[in-house]
Interface confidence: low
């Protein structure tokens, strides 16, 4: 069977959030299959998603070997009834991908908050990366260290003027007006990046001074 029976993959796209990384491409194959290969810069090609009819491939385990490395993937097209030969199948290269720089930051979750008098304490959940090391899920800060900041946007519930605070931990302690209710959201930020600097903002939470001043949000977080 000749290579004219296959279509070369196109629109190769990296979809990556908090290091969970999937390569997507087109088109859906008919009577042929794909194999994905991934390689660090100047490294050897490694087969992933061997002879698949999918148009996506999870390469998280490969890119996590060194998230500072730059990777290239390629999608090879084979006839469905292919017999392995020395002839190289047609393929398309992906754009380069550097996980540390290019993975998108996922939407953060406000874990808890407490307003006591003129102080508002907000804690951001330690986001997991969906990647395991020795059976333990890595947290976002495990990978980004000092590079990971959070921005808190907060405002009086009775007004629209937003204020901003920044931390390189997962906690904020800010001054507020006693007796006033405040609403707020948080955003993960990596200032040192040129692109993909910011995550989506979290869901908005609000204090309620006539009710309990301290609460966990509905997103329960299990501490290690």
């Amino acid at each position: 069977t000749g290579t004219t029976d296959v279509i070369v993959a196109y629109n190769l796209t990296w979809k990556s959030t908090n290091f969970k990384t999937i390569l997507e491409w087109e088109p859906k194959p008919i009577n042929y299959v794909y194999t994905v290969q991934i390689s660090p810069r100047l490294g050897d090609w490694k087969n992933k998603c061997f002879h698949t009819t999918d148009t996506e491939c999870d390469v998280t385990d490969e890119i996590m070997r060194n998230v500072k490395e730059t990777y290239v993937a390629r999608v090879l097209s084979y006839p469905a009834d292919t017999v392995l030969t020395a002839q190289e199948p047609p393929f398309t290269n992906s754009p380069p991908f550097t996980p540390y720089l290019d993975t998108n930051l996922g939407q953060p979750v406000i874990q808890s908050f407490e307003q006591v008098g003129t102080k508002l304490n907000v804690t951001v959940e330690a986001a997991r990366t969906l990647v395991r090391v020795n059976g333990t899920f890595l947290r976002l800060r495990d990978v980004f260290g000092k590079d990971l900041n959070y921005t808190l946007y907060y405002w009086r519930a009775s007004s629209t003027g937003k204020k901003k605070a920044t931390t390189n931990t997962n906690e904020f302690l800010i001054d507020v007006d006693k007796g006033e209710n405040y609403c707020f959201s948080v955003q993960a930020v990596i200032p040192s990046r040129r692109v993909n600097q910011k995550s989506p903002e979290s869901r908005i939470e609000c204090t309620s001074q006539e009710k309990a001043v301290s609460r966990e949000t509905g997103h329960h977080h299990h501490h290690h």
């Epitope: 495990d142 990978v143 290690h224």
Partner: antibody, heavy 123, light 108 residues
């Protein structure tokens, strides 16, 4: 304040083992990695390895593989470095240091250091 | 393994001098480099991380630059407290995270 306090000096015979401890205080122990670095008399710094208290993940320098084991006890915020089959060229000051990367020792440098533990290997 | 080469190995200078220390990597390490200062009998102290980011509390007379394979640590005006040995360390690849051989800055 943030500090790492190491165990005292040790004198060992060739072929023996040594276990150096490093107790952390003033910060969340499992939010950082711990690196171990040694310095032979009059020599430069040598990176020995690293451990993440959070995950137990370790990286060791190839030349020490099989002889070194790094562990942590999160209940006491203490890191340990054990070196076996000691030789005279293992005589050095051994430092533990805090590393901001806890998945892999990333390039933020080691920002807090222990005072050092002198290990002398002599027959 | 990536080799880190520092030069010079010894540098004689006077208070007020501008001092530059070079660190070369045997292959590209992007900007994954840290600089340390060490005084006799003491533990090293972090000065610079990620090639040019000044560690908190370190005087602004220290600065780092470079990317790829060539990096420099500059002390804009040498102070009496700065006479020490300086080391670079790379973090780009998997272990070992090698140090340079050190540069001793001594009084001229």
């Amino acid at each position: 304040q943030v500090q790492l306090v190491q165990s005292g000096a040790e004198v060992k015979k060739p072929g023996a083992s040594v276990k150096v401890s490093c107790k952390a205080s003033g910060y969340t122990f499992d939010a950082y990695g711990i690196s171990w670095v040694r310095q032979a008399p009059g020599q430069g710094l040598e990176w020995m390895g690293w451990i993440a208290p959070y995950s137990g993940n370790t990286n060791y320098a190839q030349k020490l593989q099989g002889r070194v084991t790094m562990t942590t006890d999160t209940s006491t915020s203490t890191a340990y470095m054990e070196l076996r089959s000691l030789r005279s060229d293992d005589t050095a000051v051994y430092y533990c240091a805090r590393d901001a990367g806890t998945y892999s020792p990333f390039g933020y440098g080691m920002d807090v250091w222990g005072q050092g533990t002198t290990v002398t290997v002599s027959s | 393994d990536i080799q880190m080469t520092q030069s010079p190995s010894t540098l004689s200078a006077s208070v007020g001098d501008r001092v530059t220390i070079t660190c070369r990597a045997s292959e590209s390490i992007s900007n994954w480099l840290a600089w340390y200062q060490q005084k006799p009998g003491k533990a090293p102290k972090l000065l610079i991380y990620k090639a040019y980011s000044l560690e908190y509390g370190v005087p602004s007379r220290f600065s780092g630059s470079g990317s790829g394979t060539e990096f420099t640590l500059t002390i804009s005006s040498l102070q009496p407290d700065d006479f020490a040995t300086y080391y670079c360390q790379q973090f780009q690849k998997l272990p070992p995270f090698t140090f340079g051989g050190g540069t001793k800055v001594e009084i001229k």
